[in-house]
Amino acid sequence: THLGIRLPLRSGLAGPPLGLRLPRETDEESEEPGRRGSFVEMVDNLRGKSGQGYYVEMTVGSPPQTLNILVDTGSSNFAVGAAPHPFLHRYYQRQLSSTYRDLRKGVYVPYTQGKWEGELGTDLVSIPHGPNVTVRANIAAITESDKFFINGSNWEGILGLAYAEIARPDDSLEPFFDSLVKQTHIPNIFSLQLCGAGFPLNQTEALASVGGSMIIGGIDHSLYTGRLWYTPIRREWYYEVIIVRVEINGQDLKMDCKEYNYDKSIVDSGTTNLRLPKKVFEAAVKSIKAASSTEKFPDGFWLGEQLVCWQAGTTPWNIFPVISLYLMGEVTNQSFRITILPQQYLRPVEDVATSQDDCYKFAVSQSSTGTVMGAVIMEGFYVVFDRARKRIGFAVSACHVHDEFRTAAVEGPFVTADMEDCGYNIPQTDESTLMTGRA
């Protein structure tokens, strides 16, 4: 996955502080794989800025070179800047690493807009605020790029956490997480809590803001409230799931559910927006406009281009509807729904108007490559990537932004028949024709 419409950090009031978490149900505790309870060393290990992605600190090579790496569940390569670039403060210097091994193979990754290319190798990698292990992993040393690195984003590479099937140049290049699980006793599961900020940040604040947590090897119960609901991973390439129903303020969009997953639906931390297939996007925007009709906004706002500003602290959250996505459940004919607030899908933008205003971009957009549940969705929830059991879990994030009237929600079960029919079967084509870019 790569930016363009990929990546952020935000939303209204923070959740309850640690120690004041709401009680949660523990009925599924025995089923959860991996270490349970506290992963104190991994909590708050992500940073980021609105629209520019969440990154974790990693070290590469011997002696260790520290880099900030974008966490991307929508791709499968570990790739780092390895040559000077105007937007990079630092980069991986292979010649300084005694443990670097050259694979004598190049890699080229084009996106809808932009690209990166580099040279493949392996080296020792660790995550300082992660599990206390060091693994030998494949690394793409980026030597040339275009519209990939973001000025001021503070990250120098990308950690693709999806499956080998979408790795470049081909599926024989083992992704980082596969290497981590193979070489250690770490359970095959990770979870993400992307927090956002909820209000526009100036540059100083943005650099200092907490972005969230990547828990490697398990689930941290302090990061969510209520219970976790799981949806099957349909196919292990992207983190593909099936959406069975969509509602705006409780009103069903009433579309053939295949449309919601045309040509796939994925969970992607490397994309900023909630991206919807063209037909679904048009129906959703029509419904959101109708729900918020006491105020009118220009077309450019609904296209995600123009910003709308309100006097600081007076954003009329109440006029904007909630968006609910129903996901296939683990039990036959059973689904559950995740509901996000406008505090998630209106993305704060800093430095455009005056300090007396709060300005936002509409962060739901159109896609030609299926539904992408990007940071706009993920910022509402604690998301568990349970690779061991081929499922993704959602619970209400303890840090999600809400107001006194509404909160993000994960609710179920709901009876939904024929959910298998909601999946779109992509016609078999040569793998090389797959679209890489997620603009």
Epitope: S293, T294, E295, K296, F297, P298, D299, G300, F301, E305, Q306, L307, V308, C309, D351, V352, A353, C359
Partner: antibody, heavy 120, light 108 residues
Framework: QLQLQESGPGLVKPSETLSLTCTVS??????????WGWIRQPPGKGLEWIGN???????YYNPSLRSRVTISVDTSKNQFFLKLSSVTAADTAVYYC????????????WGRGTLVTVSS | EIVLTQSPATLSLSPGERATLSCRAS??????LAWFQQKPGQAPRLLIY???NRATGIPARFSGSGSGTDFTLTISSLEPEDFAVYYC??????????FGGGTKVEIK
């Protein structure tokens, strides 16, 4: 065709409240296609946006004037209004009402403007 | 805050000449920019919207171009009635709020 006409006192005393009316003729102020706005221009100077209103009553104000401005609408009379409190000589200007069209983006139709002088 | 800087402040030209007016934004406003013409004692009139689209009834000699931060209003051949003050306005940040300082096109 649609026309806008500003009206109100041409002279206001310092510290008092400036009140203007914009009357819309030849069309309905309740059209869902438009916002309605106020812009002012001090003598010999540039344009300054004051604020906008939608027929539902939803308002947006210039942050620099927000504490002193109120814009309201009366759909039954096809009029919208400007009130600017605690005026000083710096508020002396030609005040224009205008329609925000082209998808709520651009001031595509303006009144002729009315000069308001703040002086004791 | 987005600031719009117009240049030159004054442009002295003769009828029939080509006029090129510039408007520069302090940060990208995409194509969300308008140009207005104001004659003495009159209200401004919308000439160009969305950077390059002529408003209804505006003669073809007026054209707008640019996107991002740099915009140009061109009057291909000045007519006597074109001598006026021209303002740009951005609407990338909505509601529309920021006008440029203006360029006066005067007879040489």
């Amino acid at each position: 065709q649609l026309q806008l006409q500003e009206s109100g006192p041409g002279l206001v005393k310092p510290s008092e409240t400036l009140s203007l009316t914009c009357t819309v003729s030849g069309g309905s102020i309740s059209s869902s296609s438009y916002y309605w706005g106020w812009i002012r221009q001090p003598p010999g100077k540039g344009l300054e946006w004051i604020g906008n209103i939608y027929y539902s009553g939803s308002t947006y104000y210039n942050p620099s004037l927000r504490s002193r401005v109120t814009i309201s609408v009366d759909t039954s009379k096809n009029q919208f209004f400007l009130k600017l409190s605690s005026v000083t000589a710096a508020d002396t200007a030609v005040y224009y009402c205008a329609r925000l069209g082209h998808g709520y983006n651009y001031f595509d139709l303006w009144g002729r403007g009315t000069l308001v002088t703040v002086s004791s | 805050e987005i600031v719009l800087t117009q240049s030159p402040a004054t442009l002295s030209l003769s009828p029939g000449e080509r006029a090129t007016l510039s408007c520069r934004a302090s940060q990208s406003v995409s194509s969300y920019l308008a140009w207005f013409q104001q004659k003495p004692g009159q209200a401004p009139r919308l000439l160009i919207y969305d950077a390059s689209n002529r408003a209804t009834g505006i003669p073809a000699r007026f054209s707008g171009s640019g996107s991002g931060t740099d915009f140009t209003l061109t009057i291909s051949s000045l007519e006597p009635e074109d001598f006026a003050v021209y303002y740009c306005q951005q609407v990338y940040v909505w509601p529309p709020r920021t006008f440029g300082g203006g360029t006066k096109v005067e007879i040489k």
